[in-house]
């Protein structure tokens, strides 16, 4: 058991151009609060999936009112840590979502209104009992700076909070196979419940139900001494009881390797062999690598697959963030000029241009009617600089040179027959249909053919995510 702790340091505009507008105003004062959601392992990032490791809401921050004309500063934050207690072992690898919520304190009917300002997500490796890890994440134009750690609740210790501690029985050192409880050096790790009958003197276990033997002893319950030659050690005085040498202090005593690293002695000191995702002299540094598949939404991972290599994600269009976890509203940058309509298709941006403009961003002003002639009595119409002919009846095409057959496009629906007429076209409808284009079914009872409107949707609030 233990607690995941999150400390928010700042929430404000990120670096670069396009500083965000302040979320609060004199007319609408507001305050911030944060929500954290934790999931074990490298799990799905969907915000709606359950927070299997736990979730927490912060207190509300101080009320903030924007100073007119001033850029959005770092916003005032709630006091204290966000704490997510976990009952079982700490998984070591986890996914997080941190949401910044705004509570508007205007004259809303029915109490304050909540809206989500920013959401950041990521996946990290973290050993319990380690130091605070610092992080910076960006969501659009906002930047969130925070630190986090996982700590075990006594009597649990270890990188996964699965080992237990108890007060020392002897003043000098812990019993066989047991280590001091860092940072509680006056306590020792309590033995786990080993296999029934496992020798308390010569056996120990790292998992419940197992029985591993100390040097010099063997057998399923570590009760059989091996020959004394095999338990000779290059150091330490002889023990009268076992005939074996009891090790004296060495560089690997107390295991200086963190996060499950294994220690081996070298001629001068020691060397730690670290598990994947940890590195450093004592395996104290944690890092997710490309081998963990950390990039979302089809992003490509760049950086080594080996643990001492950091990674970055190359994000596809429309996504950003350190893990490509944030969708970009690219139309908010108003890329279409001259009043063009912006369409974000996911894989690309498209601009639908107003008449008279063209180009990928509607940047080209088309020629007007100057020097253009419309045939067959058509007249040139100026429309935002575009050349367009309004054709006389019976003619069509860009320059009114084509004789128009109004029935060519089969305009009559539901089997209606089309007749060309001097004023355009006429549809003779099949039985049961009516309208200028035979588009409406005739209902004998006069009931409407229109579908019912969908029911209204209730707006969400932060509680429904918890």
């Amino acid at each position: 058991a233990g607690v995941f702790e999150l400390q928010i340091h700042s929430f404000g505009p990120g670096p670069g151009p396009g500083a965000p507008r302040s979320p609060c105003s004199a007319r609408l004062p507001c305050r911030l609060f944060f929500r954290v959601c934790l999931k074990p392992g490298l799990s799905e990032e969907a915000a709606e999936s359950p927070c299997a490791l736990g979730a927490a809401l912060s207190a509300r921050g101080p009320v903030y009112t924007e100073q007119p004309g001033a850029p959005a500063p770092d916003l005032p934050l709630p006091d204290g840590l966000l704490q997510v207690p976990f009952r079982d072992a700490w998984p070591g690898t986890f996914s997080f979502i941190i949401e910044t919520w705004r509570e508007e304190l205007g004259d809303q009917i029915g109490g304050p209104a909540w809206s989500l300002l920013a959401r950041v997500a990521g996946r990290r490796r973290l050993a319990a009992g380690g130091p605070w890890a610092r992080d910076i994440q960006r969501a659009g134009a906002w930047e969130l700076r925070f630190s986090y750690r996982a700590r075990c609740e006594p009597p649990a210790v270890g990188t996964a909070c699965t080992r237990l501690c108890r007060p020392r029985s002897a003043p000098s050192r812990c019993g066989p196979g047991l280590r001091p409880c860092a940072p509680l050096e006056d306590e020792c790790e309590a033995p786990l419940v080993c296999r029934a009958g496992c020798s308390p003197e010569h056996g120990f276990c790292e998992q419940p139900g197992e029985c591993r033997c100390l040097e010099g002893w063997t057998g399923p319950l570590c009760t059989v001494p091996v020959s004394t030659s095999s338990c000779l050690s290059p150091r330490g005085p002889s023990s009268a009881t076992t005939g074996c040498l009891v090790p004296g202090p060495g560089p690997c005593d107390g295991n200086p390797c963190a996060n499950g690293g294994s220690c081996s002695e070298t001629p001068r000191s020691f060397e730690c062999t670290c598990p994947r995702g940890f590195y450093g002299l004592r395996c104290e540094v944690s890092g997710v690598t490309c081998a963990d598949g950390p990039c979302f939404n089809g992003g490509l991972c760049v950086g080594g697959a080996d643990p001492d290599s950091a990674y970055i994600c190359h994000c596809p269009p429309g996504f950003q963030g350190s893990n490509c976890e944030k969708r970009v509203d690219r139309c908010s940058l108003q890329p279409c000029r001259n009043g063009g309509l912006c369409l974000d298709l996911g894989h690309a941006l498209r601009c639908r241009c107003r008449a008279g403009f063209a180009g990928p961003r509607c940047e080209h002003d088309l020629d007007d009617c100057a020097g253009r002639a419309c045939a067959n009595g058509g007249t040139c119409v100026e429309g935002g600089g575009a050349h367009r002919c309004s054709c006389a009846l019976g003619f069509g095409g860009r320059d009114c040179r084509e004789r128009a057959d109004p029935c060519a496009a089969r305009p009559c629906a539901h089997g209606g027959r089309c007749y060309a007429h001097f004023s355009g076209l006429v549809c003779a409808c099949a039985p049961g249909y009516m309208g200028a284009r035979c588009e409406f079914p005739v209902h004998p009872d006069g009931a409407s053919a229109l579908p019912a409107a969908p029911p209204g949707l209730r707006p969400g609030d932060p509680q429904r995510y918890l």
């Epitope: 598949g293 991972c301 190359h314």
Partner: antibody
């Protein structure tokens, strides 16, 4: 329809640099995708060399990292491969290929250009 | 680096027969977050560049005949051609895109 066309010298001397151009038509290289160089050795072995993304980010095969560079000219809708200090082992057919982010698949390949490294 | 191996290196079959070829990776290509295996199969006919047949281990590229089927997960993958046609004469490559991109050694199909 997207078309990719490789061009460059067919013969390069050892220790010199190999430079190839991929000309793309039918799609802007700044709109989407990652634009790769892949080579196929005489024994048919395929090797991914690196890519440049629509926004200009690059990623290279670690074994080539010290001598490869992929750049682009967006005004000409072209991207380029430069491989330094070539040896006879770099003799291969070089393909420019675009890859799709969503599927991580090499969607469309050029016809390839054969390069021989020999003195 | 992820290493990809294919077997057999070549096989000769008659038209209409069923063919299976295998691809093995040195580490799992399954991403537990996206629930996808990042493995693709390519077909390279003589004198042509490779062409994608299957992606995500089992999803057929549009326009690819349904006699081509991909299967497998983790480290072991299979490409099956249910009834070989003369035009299927080609070399077939698997490729991983879980981390960077690595191609298999290829399986040459002779009719």
């Amino acid at each position: 329809d997207v078309q990719l066309q490789e061009s460059g010298p067919g013969l390069v001397k050892p220790s010199q640099s190999l430079s190839l151009t991929c000309s793309v038509t039918g799609y802007s290289i700044t709109s989407d995708f990652y634009w790769n160089w892949i080579r196929q050795f005489p024994g048919n072995k395929l090797e991914w060399m690196g890519y440049i993304t629509y926004d200009g980010s690059t990623n290279y095969d670690p074994s080539l990292k010290n001598r490869i560079s992929i750049t682009r000219d967006t005004s000409k809708n072209q991207f380029f491969l430069k491989l330094n200090s070539v040896t006879a082992e770099d003799t291969a057919t070089y393909y420019c290929v675009y890859g799709d982010f969503n599927r991580h698949a090499m969607d469309y390949w050029g016809q390839g250009t054969s390069v021989t490294v020999s003195s | 680096d992820i290493v990809m191996s294919q077997s057999p290196s070549s096989l000769a079959v008659s038209a209409g027969e069923k063919v299976t070829m295998s691809c093995r990776s040195s580490q799992s290509l399954f991403n537990s977050r996206t629930r996808k295996n990042y493995l693709a199969w390519y077909q390279q006919k003589p004198g042509q560049p490779p062409k994608v047949l299957i992606y995500w281990a089992s999803t057929r590229e549009s326009g690819v005949p349904d006699r081509f089927t991909g299967s497998g997960s983790g480290t072991d993958f299979t490409l099956t051609i249910s009834s070989v046609q003369a035009e299927d004469l080609a070399v077939y490559y698997c490729e991983q895109s879980f981390y960077l991109f690595t191609f298999g050694t290829g399986t040459k199909l002779e009719i």
